[in-house]
């Protein structure tokens, strides 16, 4: 009973004490993206730096080929952030002409893919309507929440155009997670 | 042996458990800003409430001088938001009249800075060019991820301009720590 | 003295340890709102999908009536993201014939209910000025920041123009809160 | 401490321009508002004009044709050109510092006389 | 542009007096109501800004109160270096207009 004196009366047997430094952890930032094939009806990945600068990894949470993947179930606070940077497109023209259209727009979504289920499960997703006056411009879009997850699931972050995203600072462009 | 059955098998003999309660942690709210002189080439630092209201600082986690105190190594959540208040600027009509310039922006950056090391390092940065079309704008940059930082590291937020804070709540305008 | 072992010197005698999966934590999604009467002075209050797909609710945070009930004191994350969808106002046509007004805006805020005190208590606020040029706008307010709550506290999500939330997708549109 | 300072007011003719200065210190123009005000004799304030820290400037819209309002971060030093001056326009002219909303700090002022 | 009208235009009292000047703004500004001082040869000075709050280093005699369009500078106990006048400006649209002021002089 002597390690039980500290546990609360609602201390469930199967849920153990565990150290906090010891939880699965990555933050990854943004390295110029290349052209590469992507899923029909999905937008592209990102790949990502996990070990220069503020990027990390550690605990067993691994990064590899687009994908973070995750080492053992629990609750997991999963983030990111996409700064785009643009030139106007004929959005402003088209609408100042008096011809309403489908803007333009910018998405990110942090995806779950589960090997077992054929359909990756979208867990988060930022997007905005892009219509600037100004010439050239920028912004970021931020997500985070929390979600459970399976051991060996695989988080990536996907964007609507991987062209407009800004790779130049590690604190621009992110993404993360870390077990609750 | 007998303190040790609740710990999983991996745990690490230099990350003994703790009570999360006890874990450095703070939120910090905003205040009217006055002008300040700065270190050149880098952006303004905001002052901040760190005791009333919402606002508190808890197990050895400091505020002074515009800086959060880091005061044991560990891996933080770091977050902030600045609402940014404005009127429009010439940049629409500059745009409109055909003469595309730099865009107007506000920014944000989270900024770690450590004695032993000269420079100070960008943790988090949060850019949006302006170029609104109404008289009087109004929009927040929402910022969060997790970093690893070590005692005695200090936190900051600065932003591009400083009279365009909106000081006027509370919770428009934060900026907070705690570790994981 | 066993059990203590692990335990660092700062350990407060009154802060037991405890199991990380047995802490209270949700993470709700959205649903179609329907048009409910709401108290003056404050807008309107959103309400959650807490068990379908992405949603949960685990260790006794419940939600019921567009609250999260905080079950035990302690500092809590808590987050939301509200994405909005609009058609453009009269709002550009009247800057653009040269008539400055009001910017109509869209507004999130994460309010405490506490049923001791008589004013409920804003802990989080985005607002945006919504002046665009196009004909549809749709475009994401997210707000994540650490609380200290009460058991027996209210958390709900409150937003400027119901009819404008974007209610098609769970990624889209979320609220959570998990004890730290 | 915070300081601004005009200077370049006098006697000006009719039709001519004006440049006045307001020479800062304790703070960065990079990053704050400068505001530009002035007083008629034995009236109220009115507001000209603003320089923000990004360098965007806003113009009260009656007189913004006839204004333009510069600064030069380095020199830490903001400027009033104003032309086709015209007798109403005598007035002591304040150079103001502070948030989007308000004007925390304001220079002495500096005496604008247009006249033959 | 929005008008801002202060009364009264002038006013006489005693050290010790509790004073009240108002401000009505043409439509409603949101709270941005900042009210300042402006004695013979002195830099005008900030005195409260958003309604209420009151601006470093300045006493606490000084208060004020409003919403919407109307809005109020109480100085609880008149100090002989409070005759000055006082202006009200609105923050909340641009342009920035002023009231036309209170000159406020002992009895």
């Known amino acids: 009973l002597k390690g039980q004196e500290f546990a609360p009366s609602h201390q469930q047997v199967y849920a153990p004490l565990r150290a906090d430094g010891d939880k699965p952890r990555a933050h990854l930032t943004v390295v110029r993206q290349t052209p590469t094939q992507h899923l029909k009806n999905q937008f592209p990945a990102l790949h990502w730096e996990h070990e220069l600068g503020l990027a990390f990894t550690k605990n067993r949470m691994n990064y590899t080929n687009k994908f973070l993947l995750i080492p053992e179930s629990g609750d997991y606070f999963v983030y990111s952030q996409v700064t785009f940077r643009g030139m106007t497109s004929e959005c402003s023209e088209i609408r100042q002409a008096g011809r309403p259209n489908k803007p333009d727009s910018i998405t990110v979504v942090i995806t779950k893919v589960t090997d077992s289920y054929p359909e990756p499960t979208q867990l988060l997703m930022g997007t905005k309507s892009v219509c600037e006056v100004g010439s050239n411009w920028f912004q970021p879009i931020y997500l985070g929440a929390m979600f459970s997850l399976q051991e060996g699931d695989k988080l990536m972050v996907n964007v609507s155009d991987i062209s407009l995203v800004d790779y130049t600072k590690e604190d621009k462009t992110f993404f993360g997670a870390f077990l609750l | 042996l007998k303190g040790q059955e609740f710990a999983p098998s991996h745990q690490q003999v230099y990350a003994p458990l703790r009570a999360d309660g006890d874990k450095p942690r703070a939120h910090l709210t905003v205040v009217r800003q006055t002008p300040t002189q700065h270190l050149k080439n880098q952006f303004p630092a905001l002052h901040w409430e760190h005791e009333l209201g919402l606002a508190f600082t808890k197990n050895r986690m400091n505020y002074t001088n515009k800086f959060l105190l880091i005061p044991e190594s560990g891996d933080y959540f770091v977050y902030s938001q600045v609402t940014f208040r404005g009127m429009t600027s010439e940049c629409s009509e500059i745009r409109q009249a055909g003469r595309p310039n730099k865009p107007d922006s506000i920014t944000v950056v989270i900024t770690k800075v450590t004695d032993s090391y000269p420079e100070p390092t960008q943790l988090l940065m949060g850019t949006k060019s302006v170029c609104e079309v109404g008289s009087n704008w109004f929009q927040p940059i929402y910022l969060g991820a997790m970093f690893s930082l070590q005692e005695g590291d200090k936190l900051m937020v600065n932003v591009s301009d400083i009279s365009l804070v909106d000081y006027t709540k509370e919770d428009k305008t934060f900026f907070g720590a705690f570790l994981l | 003295l066993k059990g203590q072992e692990f335990a660092p010197s700062h350990q407060q005698v009154y802060a037991p340890l405890r199991a990380d999966g047995d802490k209270p934590r949700a993470h709700l999604t959205v649903v179609r709102q329907t048009p409910t009467q709401h108290l003056k002075n404050q807008f309107p209050a959103l309400h959650w999908e807490h068990e379908l797909g992405l949603a949960f609710t685990k260790n006794r945070m419940n939600y019921t009536n567009k609250f999260l009930l905080i079950p035990e004191s302690g500092d809590y994350f808590v987050y939301s993201q509200v994405t909005f969808r609009g058609m453009t106002s009269e709002c550009s046509e009247i800057r653009q014939a040269g008539r400055p007004n009001k910017p109509d805006s869209i507004t999130v805020v994460i309010t405490k209910v506490t049923d001791s005190y008589p004013e409920p208590t804003q802990l989080l606020m985005g607002t945006k000025s919504v002046c665009e040029v196009g004909s549809n706008w749709f475009q994401p307010i997210y707000l994540g920041a650490m609380f200290s709550l009460q058991e027996g506290d209210k958390l709900m999500v409150n937003v400027s123009d119901i009819s404008l939330v974007d209610y098609t997708k769970e990624d889209k549109t979320f609220f959570g809160a998990f004890l730290l | 401490e915070i300081q601004l300072v005009e200077s370049g007011g006098g006697l000006i003719q009719p039709g001519g321009s004006l440049r006045i200065s307001c020479a800062v210190s304790g703070f960065s123009l990079s990053s704050y508002g400068v505001d530009w005000v002035r007083q008629a004799p034995g009236k109220g304030l009115e507001w000209l004009g603003v320089i923000w820290g990004f360098g965007g400037t806003n113009y009260n819209s009656a007189l913004k044709s006839r204004l333009t309002i510069s600064k030069d971060n380095s020199k830490n030093t903001v400027y009033l050109q104003m032309n086709s001056l015209r007798a109403e326009d005598t007035a002591v002219y304040y150079c103001a510092s502070g948030n989007f909303d308000a004007m925390d700090y304001w220079g002495q002022g500096t005496l604008v006389t247009v006249s033959s | 542009d929005i008008q801002m009208t202060q009364s009264p235009s002038s006013l006489s009292a005693s050290v010790g007096d509790r004073v009240t000047i108002t401000c009505r703004a043409s439509?409603?500004?949101?709270?941005?109501l900042n009210w300042y001082q402006q004695k013979p040869g002195k830099a005008v000075k900030l005195l409260i800004y958003?309604?209420?709050r009151l601006h470093s280093g300045v006493p606490s005699r000084f208060s004020g109160s409003g919403s919407g369009t109307d809005y109020t500078l109480t100085i609880s106990s008149l100090q002989p270096e409070d005759f000055a006048t006082y202006f009200c400006?609105?923050?909340?649209?641009?342009?920035?207009?002023f009231g036309q002021g209170t000159k406020l002089e002992i009895k």
């Open positions: 400006q609105q923050g909340n649209t641009l342009p920035f207009t």
């Open positions: 439509q409603d500004i949101s709270n941005y």
């Open positions: 958003y309604t209420s």
